[in-house]
């Protein structure tokens, strides 16, 4: 028969012959022959291959380096890589999460719109009229100005995006 020019799914063409790919978690030791199936071997400890493959070497699991602020979020298997995330208060600098940076704080006048996670930074927003933030924080939202009226007080000093209003007693009308 004519040698094949293309192979089925989960096969590869080598020297005019279709051989089975190695399953995830295994590496190629030797191509198949007319008489022998493809030789595959399981990946070793701390190694993985996540696809049907013909790789002769497994990939090393990612190392979550604590010196870079990283920790293991999900331990790798022979078929999956280790997933790293950042320590509390830090987030990844990239999608691959190869290093971490400290969460950004929102300056006075800005509040936290979205609290940072291990993979995303703090998102800040300017405090709108009626709200303020007087601290630099990675957690604090903009707070509403105090309502003097509900306390039976009057505004003595107007609020800003960085300061609360100052309430005071109402002037008593003299008889």
């Amino acid at each position: 028969p004519e040698p094949p020019t293309a192979c089925r799914e989960k096969q590869y063409l080598i020297n005019s012959q279709c051989c089975s790919l190695c399953q995830p978690g295994q590496k190629l030791v030797s191509d198949c022959t007319e008489f022998t199936e493809t030789e595959c071997l399981p990946c070793g400890e701390s190694e993985f291959l996540d696809t049907w493959n013909r790789e002769t070497h497994c990939h090393q699991h990612k190392y979550c380096d604590p010196n870079l602020g990283l920790r293991v979020q999900q331990k790798g298997t022979s078929e999956t890589d280790t997933i790293c995330t950042c320590e509390e208060g830090w987030h990844c600098t990239s999608e691959a999460c190869e290093s971490c940076v400290l969460h950004r704080s929102c300056s006075p006048g800005f509040g936290v719109k979205q609290i940072a996670t291990g993979v995303s930074d703090t998102i800040c927003e300017p405090c709108p009229v009626g709200f303020f933030s007087n601290v630099s924080s990675a957690f604090e939202k903009c707070h509403p100005w105090t309502s003097c009226e509900t306390k039976d007080l009057v505004v003595q000093q107007a609020g800003t995006n960085k300061t609360d209003v100052v309430c005071g007693p109402q002037d008593r009308l003299r008889a």
Partner: antibody
Framework: QVQLVESGGGVVQPGRSLRLSCAAS????????MHWVRQAPGKGLEWVAV????????YYADSVKGRFTISRDNSKNTLYLQMNSLRAEDTAVYYC??????????WGQGTMVTVSS | EIVLTQSPGTLSLSPGERATLSCQAS???????LAWYQQKPGQAPRLLIY???SRNNGIPDRFSGSGSGTDFTLTISRLEPEDFAVYYC??????????FGGGTKVEIK
């Protein structure tokens, strides 16, 4: 460890039959093709026969075609060579060997077959 | 059928010397499917080189294979006492039959 052990050799008269066995251990026998290779006293290596991993494909050297039959029992991890109508020129050490795309990577220690009247 | 011719038939050398063994094929060996085996007296052959130039697992790097098409060479860079043996080439690209060369005996001078 990976091992092949031949047995069944001996002295036999011309025209008679003999069955050689090759017991495999230490690897997944059912995934590998297997060969028989022989070596006459003081001579070189001569390939005899091959069988595919599942036993469907078999090839023979012209010198043994029609007289020798290669077979296997994967449930017993054993390869066989049925030798009929033996001749003096079949006298040799018979080796079984594992088939890979690297050649014959594992060999047994051999079993001696002597065809003599 | 591919016929393999090995030369020389015998090579007389001293330990430490370089050994060059030749294997010539009667027609081109596809995909360089050529192997070299070492055989010592009373022992089974041992696979040294496959694919004309790749060393098998555990084979010392003083053994090297080269060549393509019809001309192949096994080189032992510095002979050790345990290297004195018979060496066979074999093609496994065109079968049946899988053919062996006649062998080269490397003996102590």
């Amino acid at each position: 460890q990976v091992q092949l052990v031949e047995s069944g050799g001996g002295v036999v008269q011309p025209g008679r039959s003999l069955r050689l066995s090759c017991a495999a251990s230490g690897f997944t026998f059912e995934k590998y093709g297997m060969h028989w290779v022989r070596q006459a006293p003081g001579k070189g290596l001569e390939w005899v026969a091959v069988i595919s991993y599942e036993g469907t494909s078999k090839y023979y050297a012209d010198s043994v075609k029609g007289r020798f039959t290669i077979s296997r029992d994967n449930s017993k991890n054993t390869l066989y060579l049925q030798m009929n109508s033996l001749r003096a020129e079949d006298t040799a050490v018979y080796y079984c060997a594992r088939d890979t795309s690297r050649g014959h990577d594992i060999w047994g220690q051999g079993t001696m077959v002597t065809v003599s009247s | 059928e591919i016929v393999l011719t090995q030369s020389p038939g015998t090579l007389s050398l001293s330990p430490g010397e370089r050994a060059t063994l030749s294997c010539q094929a009667s027609q081109s060996v596809s995909y360089n499917y050529l192997a070299w085996y070492q055989q010592k007296p009373g022992q089974a052959p041992r696979l040294l080189i496959y694919g004309a130039s790749s060393r098998n697992n555990g084979i010392p790097d003083r053994f090297s294979g080269s060549g393509s098409g019809t001309d192949f060479t096994l080189t032992i860079s510095r002979l050790e006492p345990e290297d004195f043996a018979v060496y066979y080439c074999q093609q496994y690209s065109d079968y049946p039959p899988f053919t062996f060369g006649g062998g080269t005996k490397v003996e102590i001078k």
